[in-house]
């Protein structure tokens, strides 16, 4: 059974969040996909979306967000560069499938951005200058404004009992901590 989970990324200002959302490629390869932020008690807000129909391996840049949809692999890559403290929050990928409600993808991302000197990014960070090598492109279609009320969510439980840390032998990098939290709807 698929579990809706949350993965926590702790990064410093100026660093890059680099994540992927997977989807059933047979069903959703060319569907328009979006990156949303979920604020407690509010409707998810769409920050960026792919073109409609979504183009294969074609980066779309909206401000500091870059989306890249690998159709033939069923993967949407999301990068948020030059992170700011205000970017902290809960994020999700969704697939637009009008007239049906948006289809939410696993997993949700809990991003925590803290102040801290990032200076010259370390070897395990992707510097914004490298990320911006992608030629900026804009979406041809605006992201749909409609988001189903059904995707309004409660914040997951804050109890540390529900937080499981990665296996102790995992050494991701010294800048990224990922914590998996079950989400109870």
């Amino acid at each position: 059974a698929t579990k809706l989970t949350e993965e926590k990324y702790e990064l410093k200002e100026g660093q890059t969040l680099d994540v992927k959302c997977d989807y059933t490629l047979e069903k959703f390869a060319s569907s328009q996909k979006a990156w949303q932020i979920i604020r407690d008690g509010e409707m998810p807000k769409t920050l960026a979306c792919t073109e409609r129909p979504s183009k294969n391996s074609h980066p779309v840049q909206v401000g500091r967000i870059i989306l890249e949809d690998y159709h033939d692999h069923g993967l949407l890559r999301v990068r948020m560069v030059n992170l700011q403290v205000e970017d902290s929050g809960l994020y999700q990928c969704v697939i637009y499938q009008p007239p049906k409600e948006p289809h939410m993808l696993f997993d949700r991302i809990r991003l925590v951005v803290t102040k801290g000197f990032s200076g010259t990014p370390g070897s395990n960070e992707n510097s914004t200058q490298n990320v911006y090598k992608i030629p900026p492109t804009t979406t041809k279609a605006l992201c749909p404004l409609y988001t189903s009320p059904r995707t309004v969510t409660q914040a997951p439980p804050k109890s540390t009992a529900d937080v499981s840390t990665p296996d102790s032998e995992i050494n991701l990098t010294n800048v990224t901590d990922i914590i998996r939290v079950p989400v109870f709807n």
Epitope: D18, V19, K20, Y23, S57, F106, D107, N126, T176, I178
Partner: antibody, heavy 123, light 107 residues
Framework: QVQLVQSGAEVKKPGASVKVSCKAS????????INWVRQATGQGLEWMGW????????GSVKKFRDRVTMTRDTSISTAYMELSSLRSEDTAVYYC????????????????WGQGTLVTVSS | DIQMTQSPSSLSASVGDRVTITCQAS??????LNWYQQKPGKAPKLQIY???NLETGVPSRFSGSGSGTDFTFTISSLQPEDIATYYC?????????FGQGTRLEIK
Amino acid sequence: QVQLVQSGAEVKKPGASVKVSCKASGYTFTSYDINWVRQATGQGLEWMGWMNPNSGNSGSVKKFRDRVTMTRDTSISTAYMELSSLRSEDTAVYYCVRLIGYSSAWKWSFQHWGQGTLVTVSS
Amino acid sequence: DIQMTQSPSSLSASVGDRVTITCQASRDISKYLNWYQQKPGKAPKLQIYDASNLETGVPSRFSGSGSGTDFTFTISSLQPEDIATYYCQHYDNIPITFGQGTRLEIK
């Protein structure tokens, strides 16, 4: 500790299919993608594709797309890779591999490898 | 697809030597590069990830550097147990590809 234990060697005839299993232990199976990498005798490494054991979604490189199926059984923490329409050039050692980071991270660093399964295709 | 070209394809060195292997990507891959060691009859082992980060348990004589298109893997003082084939691998985009490998032998 993390362990990936693969099924034993197989000998198959051209045109047949092979299903390789990969049993995971020492970590939460559904939290990390499983990838498959193959290596023909005396040759280099070739990435075949990935599977997210939580969602069950998978993807494979073009050359295998019509012939490979990646599945899992979460109840026994086991991933499977089935390759059909076998030909002699599919003779190789097939590895299942777990990535370094959780399934949402764009971090394709192959940290934990199974011991490999030799598949020989011969008439 | 991004092509990864390793050089040399084979290399013979003496114990205690400094050994350098290079990997060139066909386009800018930032620091999305890993290095693996494979001993005969064994599965590969991750040595360096993200171009320069040493994997846990890997001796400090191994190091990696570079970004963009040119990367280097160095063994500061070759030991007999380092005899293996070394591979680079990028993950800047899909599909992921490996270099063709560098076979390292003891003189």
